[in-house]
């Protein structure tokens, strides 16, 4: 189970994980106390058939080729949470683990 | 956390789970002893922004709009395994739980 890692200088056209730092203040999400920014990453690239396909299911659907099924697309296949401190709508300070905030791996599904 | 369910008569254009029965024999996967067929399901449809987006990450990447990032796509967000009896490469009969063979829910990610 693996995925490609790329950066802005990469010439890779296939499905790959790219670095992306999210700055909450730039979005007006100033009500997030910490972290103010974090490494989110994102997925981009082409999904040639078979390349980085995570599940047998993806192959099977491609083989069956039902009406309306698109080819697989480059999407997070492994994500992790981050701990955040923020104000909710009632002005209470909340500390919580927010799931699926960081892309750890990209694949075709 | 929910997803739409559709069938072949549906007029829904948005991301939806459709029924699909996989027949292993039809694919030439004769080495699978049981089941010979199973309900796999698949995802298809459009991902308008916000609709069925599973993670905050999807919103953040869309807003940051980095180079090469595509819009979210309709993909499995919940999958389940099936138990299978099959011949491995050494002609041994194996009974095992094969992960991510059934799509339980579709979403935009």
């Amino acid at each position: 189970d693996f995925g490609l890692d790329c950066d802005e200088h990469s010439t890779e056209s296939r499905c790959c994980r790219y670095p992306l730092t999210v700055d909450f203040e730039a979005f007006g999400w100033d009500w997030i106390i910490a972290p103010k920014r974090y490494k989110a990453n994102y997925c981009s690239g082409e999904c040639e058939f078979v390349f980085l396909q995570k599940y047998p299911h993806t192959h099977l659907v491609h083989q069956a080729n039902p009406r309306g099924s698109a080819g697989p697309c480059c999407t997070p296949t492994k994500m992790s949470p981050i701990n955040m401190l923020y104000f909710n709508g009632k002005e209470q300070i909340i500390y919580g683990k927010i799931p699926a905030m960081v892309v750890d791996r990209c694949g075709c599904s | 956390d929910f997803g739409l369910d559709c069938d072949e008569h549906s007029t829904e254009s948005r991301c939806c789970r459709y029924p699909l029965t996989v027949d292993f024999e039809a694919f030439g996967w004769d080495w699978i002893i049981a089941p010979k067929r199973y309900k796999a399901n698949y995802c298809s449809g459009e991902c308008e922004f916000v609709f069925l987006q599973k993670y905050p990450h999807t919103h953040l990447v869309h807003q940051a709009n980095p180079r090469g990032s595509a819009g979210p796509c309709c993909t499995p967000t919940k999958m389940s395994p099936i138990n299978m009896l099959y011949f491995n490469g050494k002609e041994q009969i194996i009974y095992g739980k094969i992960p991510a063979m059934v799509v339980d829910r579709c979403g935009c990610s």
Partner: antibody
Framework: EVQLVESGGGLVKPGGSLRLSCAAS????????MNWVRQAPGKGLEWVSS????????YYADSVKGRFTISRDNAKNSLYLQMNSLRAEDTTVYYC????????????WGQGTTVTVSS | DIQMTQSPSSLSASVGDRVTITCRAS??????LGWYQQKPGKAPKRLIY???SLQSGVPSRFSGSGSGTEFTLTISSLQPEDFATYYC?????????FGQGTKVEIK
């Protein structure tokens, strides 16, 4: 109770200056972006300017760019709008509004302060 | 800049009527839109955020829908206190832009 109270409005001659203030209470002011929005008599709402929590991101409407300056003092829970080179068309009620940003927008507004530009 | 076109500019309705106000964005703004109610001499009050989420404390007769470029505010059964002017606001990008407003008057 979350509250915003504007002050500093009044009568000023064309070409003159005025400084509006907005006092915030009931919430952690330093953790929110803030806006100024205005409304001419009998007219619609017009966004004027925004400032992020640490003043890193500042935006202006074209109609006020180069004449108005938005600022904030988080220690004093205060938002300001320095208005220079005032014109007759700047005659409006000015509101300050708290902003929860992308996806959420402006959720809390002050009662407004009136600025009249007339000779 | 994103233009917000609101319609109608005014409407006359009776108590109990279902009222629909629309807002069209000149380019896609996802669901980054709020609806505000304003009464004469008062500050605007937010009714709906993120196109369809009801602001806490706002009666459930108000609802919002839409995404992309077409948005709707619906009042399912107009009450006497609902006679006011309604504005949409896009908070997708800067400059922030409001619709021209819809004045809801008593028939």
């Amino acid at each position: 109770e979350v509250q915003l109270v504007e002050s500093g409005g009044g009568l000023v001659k064309p070409g003159g200056s005025l400084r509006l203030s907005c006092a915030a209470s009931g919430f952690t002011f330093s953790s929110y972006s803030m806006n100024w929005v205005r409304q001419a008599p009998g007219k619609g709402l017009e966004w004027v300017s925004s400032i992020s929590s640490s003043s890193s991101y500042i935006y202006y409407a074209d109609s006020v760019k180069g004449r108005f300056t938005i600022s904030r003092d988080n220690a004093k829970n205060s938002l300001y709008l320095q208005m220079n080179s005032l014109r007759a068309e700047d005659t409006t009620v000015y509101y300050c509004a708290r902003d929860r940003g992308y996806l959420y927008g402006m959720d809390v507004w002050g009662q407004g302060t009136t600025v009249t530009v007339s000779s | 800049d994103i233009q917000m076109t609101q319609s109608p500019s005014s409407l006359s309705a009776s108590v109990g009527d279902r009222v629909t106000i629309t807002c069209r964005a000149s380019q896609a703004i996802r669901n980054d839109l709020g609806w505000y109610q304003q009464k004469p001499g008062k500050a605007p009050k937010r009714l709906i955020y993120a196109a369809s989420s009801l602001q806490s404390g706002v009666p459930s007769r108000f609802s919002g829908s839409g995404s992309g470029t077409e948005f709707t505010l619906t009042i399912s059964s107009l009450q006497p206190e609902d006679f006011a002017t309604y504005y949409c606001l896009q908070h997708n990008s800067y400059p922030r832009t409001f619709g021209q407003g819809t004045k809801v008057e008593i028939k």
